[in-house]
C-alpha cells in the first residue's frame, strides 16, 4: 500500500470541515446528528446531505447516507439525524427475503385464482384460490434436480504445496 | 512497518516490542497491535489513535500499554505469561471515508514466554 | 465485548469453483467490516473494507456483502493461489467497540 496521504486517509477530525461543529460528549456519548472524535473529546456534527446518525453513540464516523437505487423514489431525504427514506417505484415491490431490488408487481393473478390484493411498494398483488380462498405466493415450483455421480475424482490441478 | 523486540523470556518479565514507520507520519495514522499463537488465529490487541489516544481490547487491559513517538509504536507486555507466546504485528489503519481498515503490516516479531 | 463468529472454519473446493465464507458479529457494527487473507509465515494481506470495497490490487473474483450483524465474503473462479486462511474483523468504528477477529477459514483449493 502507498505511503502517499491523501484527505480521504486522514481520520474524520483531521480533514479539513471547518463547518463542521463540535461539542463535548454527555457521558461518553454523543448526540444523534454527531460522531465521536478519535481522542474522544468532542463531538463533530455529521454533514447534512452526506451521513448521519441516529441515536447517541461513540461512533468514530458517521453513517453514510443510503442513496436512492434506479427504480426507486426518495420519500425524504438524509438529514443529518435520519437516513434517506426510499421506496419502489409504482408498480414494482421489495420483499423482505430479497430486500436488495425491486421486483415487478405481478399483472393478474393465475387462472382459477381472484385478485384480493394489491401491488404495494412492499407487497405483490395477492391471489387466492377461487374455491378455497388459499393464498398463492406466485413462486413457479422447482423442477427436482436430478443428481449424478462422477465416476472417480479427477487429478487436482493445485499441488500439496499450494 | 517492522516490529523488532521479539526473544525469548521468562513469565513475568516485563517486555517491551517496537513497532518502526517509515514514509508516513504518526500524527496522521492510527496503529494497531494485533498477535497470534503458533498455529491460531488472529487476535486484536490494541490501538494508538493519531492524536496518542489507546484502546484496548476487553482482555487486554492491564495486561498491554501501548504508547508512541514521532517514528515508533511500541507495545509493553506488562507481566507476560505462557498463553502470550505469539506473533506480534503492528499494522497501520487507513481511513476509508466511512471505515477504518489494516491496510498496511510488518513482517511480525516473534515472543516466546518459557521458564 | 463483541465477538465475530465465522464460518466455515475449513472449506474445499476445486479449480475454478465458488467459495462462501460467512461472518457474524455479536451486536450490529454497520459496514464496519474488513476481510483479510493470510497465507504461512506472512502477514494477513487487506482484502476488503467497508463490508464490500476491495482493497487496491485485490482481484474482483473477491466480493463481499452484509450489513449490521451478517457478512460474507466470496471468491469465485478459485485459483490454486487463493489457498490460505481467510479472517473477517470488525473494523475501528467505535471507541468502545473491539476489533474483534473471526476464528477464520482455511480454504483448500483442490
Known amino acids: 500500500e502507498s505511503a502517499l496521504i491523501t484527505q480521504q486517509d486522514l481520520a474524520p477530525q483531521q480533514r479539513a470541515a471547518p463547518q463542521q461543529k463540535r461539542s463535548s460528549p454527555s457521558e461518553g456519548l454523543c448526540p444523534p446528528g454527531h460522531h465521536i472524535s478519535e481522542d474522544g473529546r468532542d463531538c463533530i456534527s455529521c454533514k447534512y446531505g452526506q451521513d448521519y446518525s441516529t441515536h447517541w453513540n461513540d461512533l468514530l464516523f458517521c453513517l453514510r447516507c443510503t442513496r436512492c437505487d434506479s427504480g426507486e423514489v426518495e420519500l425524504s431525504p438524509c438529514t443529518t439525524t435520519r437516513n434517506t427514506v426510499c421506496q419502489c417505484e409504482e408498480g414494482t415491490f421489495r420483499e423482505e427475503d430479497s430486500p436488495e431490488m425491486c421486483r415487478k408487481c405481478r399483472t393478474g393473478c393465475p387462472r382459477g385464482m381472484v385478485k384480493v390484493g394489491d401491488c404495494t411498494p412492499w407487497s405483490d398483488i395477492e391471489c387466492v384460490h377461487k374455491e378455497s380462498g388459499t393464498k398463492h405466493s406466485g413462486e413457479v415450483p422447482a423442477v427436482e434436480e436430478t443428481v449424478t455421480s462422477s465416476p472417480g475424482t479427477p487429478a487436482s490441478p493445485c499441488s500439496l504445496s499450494g | 512497518v517492522e516490529e523488532s523486540g521479539g526473544r525469548l523470556v521468562t513469565p513475568g518479565t516485563p517486555l517491551t516490542l517496537t513497532c518502526t514507520v517509515s514514509?508516513?507520519?504518526?500524527?496522521?495514522?492510527?496503529m494497531s497491535w494485533v498477535r497470534q499463537a503458533p498455529g491460531k488465529g488472529l487476535e486484536w490487541i490494541g490501538i494508538?489513535?493519531?492524536?496518542?489516544t489507546t484502546y484496548y481490547a476487553s482482555w487486554a487491559k492491564g495486561r498491554f500499554t501501548i504508547s508512541k513517538t514521532s517514528t515508533t509504536v511500541d507495545l509493553k507486555v506488562t507481566s507476560p505469561t505462557t498463553e502470550d507466546t505469539a506473533t506480534y504485528f503492528c499494522?497501520?489503519?487507513?481511513?476509508?471515508?466511512?471505515?477504518?481498515?489494516?491496510?498496511?503490516w510488518g513482517p511480525g516479531t516473534l515472543v516466546t514466554v518459557s521458564s | 465485548a463483541l465477538v465475530m463468529t465465522q464460518t466455515p472454519s475449513s472449506v474445499s473446493a476445486a479449480v475454478g469453483g465458488t467459495v462462501t465464507i460467512n461472518c457474524q458479529a455479536s451486536?450490529?457494527?454497520?459496514?464496519?467490516l474488513a476481510w483479510f487473507q493470510q497465507k504461512p509465515g506472512q502477514p494477513p494481506k487487506l482484502l476488503i473494507y467497508e463490508t464490500s470495497k476491495l482493497a487496491s490490487g485485490v482481484p474482483s473474483r473477491f466480493s463481499g456483502s452484509g450489513s449490521g450483524t451478517e457478512f460474507t465474503l466470496t471468491i469465485s473462479d478459485l485459483e490454486c493461489d487463493d489457498a490460505a486462511t481467510y479472517y473477517c474483523?470488525?473494523?475501528?468504528?467505535?471507541?468502545?467497540?473491539?476489533?474483534?477477529f473471526g476464528g477464520g477459514t482455511e480454504v483448500v483449493v483442490k
Open positions: 494508538i489513535s493519531s492524536s496518542g
Open positions: 451486536q450490529n457494527i454497520y459496514s464496519n
Open positions: 474483523q470488525s473494523s475501528w468504528h467505535s471507541i468502545s467497540t473491539d476489533c474483534a
Open positions: 499494522a497501520r489503519e487507513t481511513y476509508y471515508g466511512y471505515s477504518y481498515a489494516a491496510g498496511l
Open positions: 514514509g508516513f507520519s504518526l500524527s496522521n495514522y492510527a
